[in-house]
Interface confidence: low
């Protein structure tokens, strides 16, 4: 997260860190007792390596009660996802077992009516992304308040020219932003989750680039049918 | 196929308005700005504005505020220009684009004559 | 505003000869928002390039686009018939968006 502050320690319950091999990989939000979800590419990036997932952070270093790191049972990327495009960029992981509910691991709801959030409506991105340019990776998860932009703007020929989709949606980049780490994590307006974080290699920070996230609203059916 | 349709040619008096409308099809009409250009015979091509069809924000060219008004109707995809109390000066093409300027109206002639 | 000054006016080339065009602006303008269009007497502009040096879809591979600053150039590397057209130049680096007063350029 750039830009962006400390969060709230375990204010965010639905909070994950995708990691592969113990370390830090993707951001993701539990969503069912047993069910995160994240972005697609992010699985890219695991290789060969075990894939887990904490739930229950604030510090991913230190020993805090709430923390317990899941096994993956099975991993589902989006049917349609693809290793050259953010098309489809949604993957549900289901947990080896059902997450232990408490006040620091709740799932979130997520939107189902599909409909675009307002242009400039604050939303909340959180994760254990980078913070610096430079690379600099948090212990402790950041967050940051993002305007929603309009997807007119966002497809200008000089921000994303024509690419973002009706099943995606963008928010301001001004120096705030997401970035590198950050992919998976939830966009939450209005205290339910609206778009994940998509996992593309694009300029963090640069409000040309505004950031690009999933709507989950468009993929309630792929939902709905994978938790069931 | 991205189309943006522009009305046929307008002989229009001094001091008139005329309003030209641009109906896109093709692509989801809120996903791009449209934009509003003028040619005058045989010169050059002067912007006169943009609109954005989610909010109807609007850019002018300070040159052409007071003369153009942009607006946009969603319901029916069509972005309109009205320009008004018309002289010969403003005997000119215009185009209507979107997409940052991929694409193009075929343009509508304004004559204003007497 | 930015005012984008084109040479020359008008060019007249024989097939196959190597054509440059350039775009000079007054201040300088960012390349990712620097543009050229062609245009056919009777039809709309046509988006040829853009950011600089990206071919819109359909142009053919002849045609290339460099600069900088305050300097740009559209470059045909062998003429053909079907190029004669007028050329704009067009940035919206800074609003109003400006466009060049256009090279005409015909077939020898």
């Known amino acids: 997260i750039l830009g962006g502050r400390e969060a709230e320690a375990h204010a965010r319950p639905y909070m994950a860190s995708v990691q592969v091999n113990g370390e830090h990989l993707c951001g993701g939000v539990l969503v069912a007792e047993q069910w995160v979800l994240s972005a697609a590419h992010c699985l890219e990036d695991a290789a060969d390596g075990k894939v887990q997932v904490l739930l229950g952070a604030h510090s991913l270093s230190q020993p805090e009660p709430s923390k317990r790191l899941y096994d993956v049972l099975r991993a589902v990327p989006h049917p349609d996802s693809r290793p050259d495009t953010i098309d489809h960029d949604l993957l549900l992981l289901q947990l080896s077992e059902k997450a232990t509910l408490g006040p620091a691991v709740r799932p979130l709801p997520w939107q189902r009516v599909d409909r675009d959030v307002e242009p400039g409506t604050l939303c909340d991105v959180a994760g254990w992304g980078i913070v610096s340019h430079a690379g600099r990776r948090p212990d402790r998860l950041q967050h940051v308040l993002l305007p929603v932009l309009d997807r007119a703007t966002c497809n200008r020929r000089t921000h994303h020219d024509g690419a973002i989709t009706q099943r995606m949606m963008c928010a301001e980049s001004n120096r705030r932003d997401s970035c590198k780490g950050d992919s998976g994590g939830p966009l939450v307006c209005g205290g339910v989750l609206e778009g994940v974080v998509t996992s593309g290699s694009r300029v963090c920070g640069n409000r040309k680039k505004p950031g690009i996230y999933t709507r989950v609203a468009s993929y309630a059916a792929w939902i709905d049918s994978v938790l069931a | 196929e991205v189309l943006l349709q522009q009305s046929g040619p307008e002989l229009v008096k001094p001091g008139a308005s005329v309003k030209i409308p641009c109906k896109a099809s093709?692509?989801?009409?809120?996903?791009?700005?449209i934009d509003w250009v003028k040619q005058s015979h045989g010169k050059s091509l002067e912007w006169i504005g943009d609109?954005?069809?989610?909010?109807?924000?609007?850019n002018y060219n300070q040159k052409f505020k007071g003369k153009a008004t942009l607006t946009v109707d969603k319901s029916s995809s069509t972005a309109y220009m009205e320009l008004r109390s018309l002289t010969s000066e403003d005997t000119a093409v215009y185009y209507c684009?979107?997409?940052?300027?991929?694409?193009w109206g075929q343009g509508t002639l304004v004559t204003v004559s007497a | 505003q930015i005012v984008l000054t084109q040479s020359p006016a008008f060019m007249s080339a024989s097939p196959g000869e190597k054509v440059t065009l350039t775009c000079s602006a007054s201040?300088?303008?960012?390349?990712?928002?620097l543009y050229w269009y062609q245009q056919k007497p009777g039809s709309s502009p046509k988006l040829w390039i853009y950011?600089?040096?990206n071919l819109a879809s359909g142009v053919p591979g002849r045609f290339s686009g460099s600069g900088s600053g305050t300097s740009y150039s559209l470059t045909i590397s062998s003429m053909e018939a079907e190029d004669a057209a007028s050329y704009f130049c067009?940035?919206?680096?800074?609003?109003?968006?400006?466009f060049g007063a256009g090279t005409k350029l015909e077939l020898k």
């Open positions: 201040s300088s303008v960012s390349s990712s928002y």
């Open positions: 684009g979107t997409g940052d300027y991929a694409y």
């Open positions: 093709g692509y989801t009409f809120t996903d791009y700005n």
């Open positions: 609109i954005n069809p989610n909010n109807g924000g609007i």
């Open positions: 950011s600089t040096s």
């Open positions: 067009h940035q919206w680096t800074s609003y109003p968006p400006t």
